[in-house]
């Protein structure tokens, strides 16, 4: 019996088609992805093949103005239109709190939303009961397939799930649910979830009875053969894990941003064992036409976004200096504003010993593309912020050793004076450079804001200590020559859309007046 699994993950609000790098579509003839194009391909496969499931492994939320404006209603609407069969909860589904998940998505989705390792307690338990499930048994042809969900247990550090949701260890939580499915005579089981490729592989290895793992969170691109675009495969598709009980378990993920549709064909025997698995992600490029009815719906929903872009978010009473003459040479108040917003967006008081789990921010000056003039009545709009941060990136959470941070700050000024983009703006860091010294030895003082303290203060950076840092995904991926970050990071979790982080902060503060205050000397 053959099952076709179509899957997406980490779509992050890319409802409209995008450019090849998943930023805003400029030249339509070269654009990719988007729900209208996805629907065309899904329908084509549904017509051609008998047993098809369309699954999403989480993080539909967060990433473009679509989410900022529609707050998840767009996810429910278009996933319903595409007739998804199931979705796992990702960490970003909690970005607007539990209410921001329940109302727009859980109550509106016509498909099951799953996570076995999230347990509700207190007053939330009855409110959320039945709105998401640990597993769902789906009829497919004359067979049944069990789908069991999971979500990163780091979610409390990455999003805003509140205090009434407990995120358990994935493997510990999944095993009893899989065992229950087995007792119900469900012998074909897919683990669908959002904890990253390493955890996906562990689940395949450790959870007895899981036949296939469909994952997300790490934006992992797998491919067999010559890849069709710029993404470099992390392994073959599917990636085969040998389980502890001696089975070959296929593990898949489909990169991110709706650029690809994962396509996996599984052959099951009478006992539900995987006899064979093969496939590849399908690149959703312009050779696949956009479905006209979905496209028309997208255009209808688009109107509200254009109106939103020009509305006032808040005011500034000072010039926001985002000029390259400032931000690539010295501390600039636009850099300070953005870093303050980045830290504010990551306030998570999850431990009494820590005032916050992260206190530091770094930001490449070259990523700040425009100033904002306060003489326009001080008004700041989304449109203004899109000029400052035009690349559609995210502000991510990483863990780095002190020694890596030191290297990063040396790199920041290794060719100082040439107006290059690697000059770092900071938050929660005091750095002193001596530019008379030779490159690689110019950082003379590097103090960082403590987290395990009730009164935050600056202490010297310790080379062997592991620090959490918020930074643009561009830097996490080694951009602007920050190869040491990419090579040495100990953990990387993708965060919220850059403009959204700054716009939320400005809306919260109402009036802003960031200063140059001696963070960089």
């Amino acid at each position: 019996w053959e099952l076709t699994i179509l899957h997406t993950n980490d779509v992050h609000s890319r409802l409209e088609q995008t450019s090849e790098d998943s930023s805003k579509c400029v030249n339509a003839s070269r654009c990719m992805g988007g729900v209208a194009r996805l629907f065309t391909k899904v329908q084509q496969i549904r017509r051609a093949e008998p047993n098809v499931l369309l699954l999403d492994a989480g993080d539909q939320y967060q990433g473009t103005i679509w989410f900022t404006v529609y707050k998840g209603a767009e996810v429910a609407h278009f996933m319903n239109a595409l007739r998804y069969d199931a979705m796992a909860l990702g960490n970003h589904e909690f970005d607007n709190g539990v209410e921001g998940l329940i109302e727009p998505l859980l109550k509106e989705a016509k498909f099951p939303i799953l996570s076995a390792n999230i347990k509700a307690k207190g007053p939330l338990a009855s409110q959320i009961s039945g709105l998401y499930l640990p597993y769902k048994v789906l009829p497919v042809g004359d067979e049944v397939v069990g789908i069991v969900g999971y979500t990163s247990k780091e979610t409390p550090f990455l999003s805003n799930p509140g205090t009434n949701l407990v995120f358990e260890d994935e493997i510990t939580a999944l095993q009893p649910e899989v065992d229950k499915l087995k007792t119900l005579n469900v012998n074909k089981i897919i683990a669908l979830g959002h904890s990253g490729f390493e955890m996906d592989k562990l689940i395949a290895q450790k959870v007895r009875g899981v036949d296939v793992v469909v994952g997300g969170h790490s934006n992992t691109f797998l491919y067999t053969g010559n890849p069709p675009s710029k993404e470099v495969p992390a392994g073959k598709y599917p990636f085969i894990v040998t389980s502890d009980d001696g089975r070959k378990v296929p593990v898949v993920q489909a990169y991110a941003f709706g650029k690809y549709l994962g396509y996996l064909k599984i052959e099951f025997d009478e006992r539900g064992n995987v006899i064979s698995s093969h496939g590849n992600p399908i690149l959703l490029n312009s050779s696949i036409p956009e479905d006209p009815s979905i496209k028309a719906d997208i255009n209808k929903w688009r109107i509200k976004l254009d109106n939103y872009s020009t509305q006032e978010l808040g005011k500034t009473i000072v010039y926001l200096d985002g000029s390259s003459q400032s931000c690539r040479f010295r501390e600039c108040n636009m850099g300070n504003l953005i870093c303050d917003a980045m830290i504010n967006n990551n306030l998570r008081h999850t431990d009494e010993m820590f005032w916050n789990h992260v206190s530091m921010c770094i930001l490449n000056g070259g990523g700040i593309r425009s100033p904002i003039d306060e003489r326009n009545n001080g008004t700041i709009t989304w449109e203004n912020l899109a000029a400052v941060l035009p690349f559609g990136g995210t502000f991510d959470l990483v863990q780095l050793k002190g020694s890596t941070l030191k290297k990063a700050f040396e790199h920041s000024v290794h060719r100082y004076g040439q107006s290059t983009g690697e000059f770092l703006q900071v938050g929660g860091i005091h750095v002193v450079y001596d530019l008379s010294r030779k490159p690689g030895d110019r950082v003379v003082k590097l103090d960082v804001l403590c987290t395990k303290c009730r009164v935050p203060s600056y202490d010297p950076l310790k080379m062997d200590e592991v620090y959490k840092v918020i930074l643009p995904n561009f830097l996490a991926n080694g951009g602007d020559g920050f190869q040491m970050i990419k090579d040495e990071l100990l953990r990387h979790d993708s965060g919220d859309q850059d403009i959204n982080v700054v716009s939320t902060y400005i809306s919260k503060m109402k009036v802003i007046y960031p200063a140059v205050e001696g963070r960089i000397k």
Partner: antibody, heavy 113, light 106 residues
Framework: EVTLKESGPVLVKPTETLTLTCTVS????????IQWVRQPPGKLLEWLGV???????DYNAAFISRLTISKDTSKSQVVLTMTNMDPVDTATYYC???????WGQGTLVTVSS | DIQMTQSPSSLSASVGDRVTITCRAS??????LNWLQQKPGKAIKRLIY???SLDSGVPSRFSGSGSGTEYTLTISSLQPEDFATYYC????????FGGGTKVEIK
């Protein structure tokens, strides 16, 4: 639980027709095929034929003129019919799942007058 | 038709021994190979499917490997209950079996 069980006569006269039934539980014949295999006493396993989930059948070329495999999906039963039986057809007859994950106990059929 | 050549046809071994049985296919069968165990008066039991995946409840001392036309069943440490006849079965085309290997007590 996935099980298969063969049933039918234990003794068949030469030139007669053998009819064996394989009753399936734990999976659907609309999703999976059933294979038939036999083993003469002290000899090797020999594939006879298969009926696929869609209802079509394939046969070992050596038996194509004598063998018919059919099914009744609603009853979860597959029927093997072999005509013109001969003493050399004495064997244990097995039905098995399409992928060999499950086998019946086998039924010993003796062809003798 | 695909022919399967299995060797040895029989072997004598002691408890604790490592036993290896091989099957050669007449053409590439792309990992579509089972190993079966047959004991007198018992139903045939599949031990390994798709070349190397272990069936549920089968001890981990059994392992399978191979690709293309060459396939191997290994019993890492022979136990008393392992004395039986073993067959390879290819299902890339119409089923064909190896000639069997009878594992006997030395």
């Amino acid at each position: 639980e996935v099980t298969l069980k063969e049933s039918g006569p234990v003794l068949v006269k030469p030139t007669e027709t053998l009819t064996l039934t394989c009753t399936v539980s734990g999976f659907s014949l609309s999703s999976y095929g059933i294979q038939w295999v036999r083993q003469p006493p002290g000899k090797l396993l020999e594939w006879l034929g298969v009926i696929w989930s869609g209802g079509s059948a394939d046969y070992n070329a050596a038996f194509i003129s004598r063998l018919t495999i059919s099914k009744d999906t609603s009853k979860s039963q597959v029927v093997l019919t072999m005509t013109n039986m001969d003493p050399v057809d004495t064997a244990t007859y097995y039905c098995a799942g399409q992928y060999g994950s499950v086998w019946g106990q086998g039924t010993l059929v003796t062809v003798s007058s | 038709d695909i022919q399967m050549t299995q060797s040895p046809s029989s072997l004598s071994a002691s408890v604790g021994d490592r036993v290896t049985i091989t099957c050669r296919a007449s053409q590439d069968i792309g990992d579509r190979l089972n190993w079966l165990q047959q004991k007198p008066g018992k139903a045939i039991k599949r031990l390994i499917y798709a070349t190397s995946s272990l069936d549920s409840g089968v001890p981990s001392r059994f392992s399978g490997s191979g690709s293309g036309t060459e396939y191997t069943l290994t019993i890492s440490s022979l136990q008393p209950e392992d004395f039986a006849t073993y067959y390879c079965l290819q299902y890339a085309g119409s089923w064909t079996f190896g000639g069997g290997t009878k594992v006997e007590i030395k």
